[in-house]
Interface confidence: medium
């Protein structure tokens, strides 16, 4: 069964969804879809990354935490009640089935009041999860073949970014991770 | 250290296909991206596109589709750019520069530049 | 692609000046800008990456902030050496664009 997030309309709603790059310069495929994750790819696609960066989004749906490190959660703009409903984020991991996939369903709640657009997220739900950073090894290398090889400052250097970055916030909201490799 | 050399200037007619390269050192070539900017006279910066010469991955410029090739040459560490049907606005300082050690998005470092003048 | 609206296109400075640019995206590019720094006739130089880490060796007077569509590029104190242009550059989606440059003059 789908997570469910809530949001009120006029806020930002944020769909959370997480994976663990091999290494930061070769991403794995990502694509946003309305409704529930079909067989294959995403279905009334809203935004898709590449290898390396956002190559399609629709207004009002954006990236906002750092995707190049595998934070691909979901922003939507200022919501309404149209706005509701499932929401796909499928990690598009190469190789014959091998994508994940998570549903995230959205409630949107009418405003109390007319509220001013906030950037404030409504959980509702939490699931444990696990984000590591590590290094560039012959697992990756199956997995996603040609990367960049990352040595052990690379490695701390990133570890650092991590915690400093917006991303170690998200780590203590609810979401959904999958470790690559 | 990083040193990313370029190739001299050029002088083209309009029509005529330019190709630059930028000869890499001091690091591993295959590690990292490769952009190639581009600045006319008093102008911007204009991004052209990029390669990634482990797997010879590329993305173009919309804007350049058709006219621009990016390759590499893994064996000198040198990445190559074409561009063909050359305009006069196409005047411009042509930069090789490398996808960052700390982001592979932006670029720690830059070729000199390679002058190409379109005139007939 | 995304329109990077770079103010203000001069900027009149003296030795010492606390000064800001800044850069607005077309739309939300989260903290992928980068600011570099280019003196005539020399190749850019990058100053700051995702928005606010300042690159290796770059002197801590040079800070940027911001993140989404707003970002903001400061020079604590100017130093001589420190008249040039600076661009900002968003790297969320190709095509990479970058603004029209903001040019440090002696008042």
């Known amino acids: 069964s789908e997570v469910e997030y809530r949001a009120e309309v006029g806020q930002n709603a944020y769909l959370p969804c997480f994976y663990t790059p091999a290494a930061p310069g070769n991403l794995v495929p990502v694509c946003w879809g309305k409704g529930a994750c079909p067989v294959f790819e995403c279905g009334n696609v809203v935004l898709r990354t590449d290898e390396r960066d956002v190559n399609y989004w629709t207004s009002r749906y954006w990236l906002n935490g750092d995707f190049r490190k595998g934070d691909v959660s979901l922003t939507i703009e200022n919501v309404t009640l149209a706005d509701s409903g499932i929401y796909c984020c499928r990690i598009q991991i190469p190789g014959i089935m091998n994508d994940e996939k998570f549903n995230l369903k959205l409630v949107i709640k009418p405003a109390k009041v007319t509220p001013a657009p906030t950037r404030q997220r409504d959980f509702t739900a939490a699931f444990p999860r696990m984000l590591t950073t590590r290094g560039h090894g012959p697992a990756e290398t199956q997995t996603l073949g040609s990367l960049p090889d990352i040595n052990l400052t690379q490695i701390s250097t990133l570890a650092n970014e991590l915690r400093d970055s917006r991303l170690a916030n998200d780590l203590r909201d609810s979401g959904a991770t999958i470790r690559i490799g | 250290q990083v040193q990313l050399v370029q190739s001299g200037a050029e002088v083209k007619k309009p029509g005529a296909s330019v190709k630059v390269s930028c000869k890499a050192s001091g690091y591993t070539f295959t590690d990292y991206y490769m952009d190639w900017v581009r600045q006319a006279p008093g102008q911007g910066l204009e991004w052209l596109g990029y390669?990634?010469?482990?797997?010879?991955?590329?993305s173009y410029n919309q804007k350049f589709k058709g006219r621009v090739t990016m390759t590499t040459d893994k064996s000198t560490s040198t990445a190559y750019m074409e561009l063909r049907s050359l305009r006069s606005d196409d005047t411009a300082v042509y930069y090789c520069a490398r996808g960052g050690y700390y982001s592979y998005y932006s670029y720690d470092y830059w070729g000199q530049g390679t002058t190409v003048t379109v005139s007939s | 692609s995304i329109v990077m609206t770079q103010t203000p296109k001069f900027l009149p400075v003296s030795a010492g000046d606390r000064v800001t640019m800044t850069c607005k995206a077309s739309?939300?590019?989260?903290?992928?800008v980068a600011w570099y720094q280019q003196k005539p006739g020399q190749s850019p130089k990058l100053l700051i990456y995702y928005a606010s880490n300042r690159y290796t060796g770059v002197p801590d007077r040079f800070t940027g902030s911001g993140s989404g569509t707003d970002f903001t590029f400061t020079i604590s104190s100017v130093q001589v050496e420190d008249l040039a242009v600076y661009f900002c550059?968003?790297?969320?989606?190709?095509?990479?664009?970058f603004g029209t440059g903001t040019k440090l003059e002696i008042k």
């Open positions: 739309q939300s590019v989260g903290n992928n």
């Open positions: 550059q968003q790297h969320y989606s190709s095509p990479y664009t």
């Open positions: 390669i990634y010469p482990n797997n010879a991955g590329t």
